[in-house]
Every structure is written in structure tokens, then in C-alpha cells.
């Protein structure tokens, strides 16, 4: 079961539903972006492989005061089996490149759409 906290989800949902909603939230962010997302904040780039959800959360959680990605942070926490806090990098294996949050979101969205199309919901 996938359970996403906060107001993101009404309770446990199938993994495919959770992934669908995460994709839609990232689409929302990219479509509604006017000014630079999160004031152009930089985050660690991640490998879009196993442990990707925790790694994405560990990278994004270090961005504070950016309401545009708060829902995404909450949704990602539903995919990550362990608690993630700022400054934690257990899943973030490679920390050599920083990119803007906007680019991070676009890259993540493209990859999640690919997983969804391929039926990789877990």
C-alpha cells in the first residue's frame, strides 16, 4: 500500500494512483511556473534509478520556504520507506552536480512519465 501524508492523499492508494498523482503535481509545477521556481534554488542532481524517490526527497527537502514544491515533498515522502530530514544524504549516492529546482522537476517528471508508460508503478 502507498500512503501519502498531509492533504496530498485521503489514505492508502495503489502505487499506480500515487505515481499518477505525483506526475500530475509535477506537471502543475511546470505549467504554472512564472518566476524562477524556488527563486532559482540549486539542488543536488540524482541518479534516476533504484532509490530514486528517497534520493529526490533528500535533494528537494533542502529547499526551504518554497511553497510550490511543498506538496511534491509530501508526496515523495509517501514513496520513501524511511524518514528523510534536511541534510540527510543516505540515498543520494552521487553529489557532484547541482542544478536548478526547475530543471530537477523537469528531469524527474520525464523519468516518472517513462516509468508510468512502462507500467513500473512500484
Amino acid at each position: 500500500l502507498t500512503c501519502l501524508g498531509g492533504f496530498a492523499s485521503p489514505g492508502p492508494v495503489p502505487p499506480s494512483t500515487a505515481l499518477r498523482e505525483l506526475i500530475e503535481e509535477l506537471v502543475n509545477i511546470t505549467q504554472n511556473q512564472k518566476a524562477p521556481l524556488c527563486n532559482g534554488s540549486m539542488v543536488w542532481s540524482i541518479n534516476l534509478t533504484a532509490g530514486m524517490y528517497c534520493a529526490a526527497l533528500e535533494s528537494l527537502i533542502n529547499v526551504s520556504g518554497c511553497s510550490a514544491i511543498e506538496k511534491t515533498q509530501r508526496m515523495l515522502s509517501g514513496f520513501c520507506p524511511h524518514k528523510v530530514s534536511a541534510g540527510q544524504f543516505s540515498s543520494l549516492h552521487v553529489r557532484d552536480t547541482k542544478i536548478e529546482v526547475a530543471q530537477f522537476v523537469k528531469d524527474l517528471l520525464l523519468h516518472l512519465k517513462k516509468l508510468f508508460r512502462e507500467g513500473q508503478f512500484n
Epitope: 500500500l1 492523499s9 485521503p10 492508494v13 495503489p14 502505487p15 499506480s16 494512483t17 499518477r20 498523482e21 506526475i23 500530475e24 506537471v27 502543475n28 505549467q31 508510468f116 507500467g119 508503478f121
Partner: antibody
Framework: EVQLQESGPGLVKPSETLSLTCTVS????????WNWIRQPPGKGLEWIGY???????YYNPSLKSRVTISRDTSKNQFSLKLSSVTAADTAVYYC????????????WGQGTTVTVSS | DIQMTQSPSSLSASVGDRVTITCHAS??????LSWYQQKPGKAPKLLIY???DLHTGVPSRFSGSGSGTDFTLTISSLQPEDFATYYC?????????FGGGTKVEIK
């Protein structure tokens, strides 16, 4: 109360494109997921695909190469196009809503019958 | 794709009977199963979701159970308006798939 109404030609020639529209009243297509489902005569239901509140689409892989779902937010409508039809595409076509965070179809149109024949 | 198999494909019953319909999934779908009722010439109507949760306005004589791969729809006391075809649907993964249907006829 959200209501759905399908419309479109009841007869389509083989190899042509089937085009249907679903009009949504009592709600906005800028929320939730809007689906097409079909039912061949005397058979079960087949999910075709959806268009999301963001305009994102996802199609059943078995039909993906022939299907396009689009929307017109100004008219609160979404549409289905199915190309290169054959007699096997003869069915009752339903539009249906899937609410955010759900995976079941809670509101359906009454359905429209499409026959593929020359 | 996840295959959904319903049994029986049809059954005859009388008003007041207890009716049970089963649905089998080709792989584990947890509790992500819904049931629909369809009458001739009409669209399907949602009865049950999450295997056992009754949709708004659905009479309490309908109930659902099961998890994993095997599920059951039960009508505790069949009413005249319940003669219809019933379909299960899985929501575990895309593409969403339906069972072949079970037609409940008057004996």
C-alpha cells in the same frame, strides 16, 4: 451533480476515424480524470484511456497507436479519436470520471453506440 | 496486463436468495478492486470500491470481501431490481481491466 453526455456519429466506415465527444455538466474538466471505456456487443468492458485535469493523457497500450484523447476546456468537453477502425471497434462507447486519488469510475455517461460498417 | 476472471458467467436465482459472485485476479491486487452493476441498455454503476467499501446510495444488501487475488460480491437478499450483469475492475495498475461479467437472471 456531475453529468456526462456522449455524442458523435453512430456509423463509421472501416479504415476511417471514429470521433466522439463527451460534454461534462455540473463540474469542470479542469479537475479529475476523464476516461473513455468501450463495450463490444454482448461483451465486457475495456478501458481506452484518460485525459487528466492538466491535459496529460494515458492510453491502454493495446490501443495506443490508434487513440487520441483531447479536450476543450472552454466547452467543458473531451474527445476520443480512434483511427483505422475495423468491425472489431463496433461497441458502446462510454465516457466516465475518475476522481483524483481514486482508481474506480464513479460517474458514467449513458453511452453511445458506434457501428463500423461499409 | 492483469487478467480478471469472474465466475460464474451467469446464474439463475429467485427474489430473496443470497447470491455470491467471485472475481479472481491474475496477480496480487491488494484491495484495489471495485464492483459495478449494469442493466441492459444502461451504463455501469459503481457499487463497491476498495473490495468492501459501499459507494454512496448503494443498498446495504450488497457487500464485498477479499484481498490479494480472490474477491467476492454478495447480495444478501436478491431484489427484483438486482437482476443485472455485474463486473469487477482492478485498480492496482494500468491499464485498468475488468472481469468478463456475471449475469444474474430470474429463475
Amino acid at each position: 451533480e456531475v453529468q456526462l453526455q456522449e455524442s458523435g456519429p453512430g456509423l463509421v466506415k472501416p479504415s476511417e476515424t471514429l470521433s466522439l465527444t463527451c460534454t461534462v455538466s455540473g463540474g469542470s474538466i479542469s479537475s479529475d480524470y476523464w476516461n473513455w471505456i468501450r463495450q463490444p456487443p454482448g461483451k465486457g468492458l475495456e478501458w481506452i484511456g484518460y485525459i487528466s485535469y492538466n491535459g496529460n493523457t494515458y492510453y491502454n497500450p493495446s490501443l495506443k497507436s490508434r487513440v487520441t484523447i483531447s479536450r476543450d476546456t472552454s466547452k467543458n468537453q473531451f474527445s476520443l479519436k480512434l483511427s483505422s477502425v475495423t468491425a472489431a471497434d463496433t461497441a458502446v462507447y462510454y465516457c466516465a470520471r475518475l476522481a483524483k486519488w481514486t482508481w474506480y469510475f464513479d460517474i458514467w455517461g449513458q453511452g453511445t453506440t458506434v457501428t463500423v460498417s461499409s | 496486463d492483469i487478467q480478471m476472471t469472474q465466475s460464474p458467467s451467469s446464474l439463475s436465482a429467485s427474489v430473496g436468495d443470497r447470491v455470491t459472485i467471485t472475481c479472481h485476479a491474475s496477480q496480487n491486487i491488494n484491495v484495489w478492486l471495485s464492483w459495478y452493476q449494469q442493466k441492459p441498455g444502461k451504463a455501469p454503476k459503481l457499487l463497491i470500491y476498495k473490495a468492501s467499501d459501499l459507494h454512496t446510495g448503494v443498498p446495504s444488501r450488497f457487500s464485498g470481501s477479499g484481498s490479494g487475488t480472490d474477491f467476492t460480491l454478495t447480495i444478501s437478499s436478491l431484489q427484483p431490481e438486482d437482476f443485472a450483469t455485474y463486473y469487477c475492475q482492478q485498480g492496482q495498475s494500468y491499464p485498468y481491466t475488468f472481469g468478463g461479467g456475471t449475469k444474474v437472471e430470474i429463475k
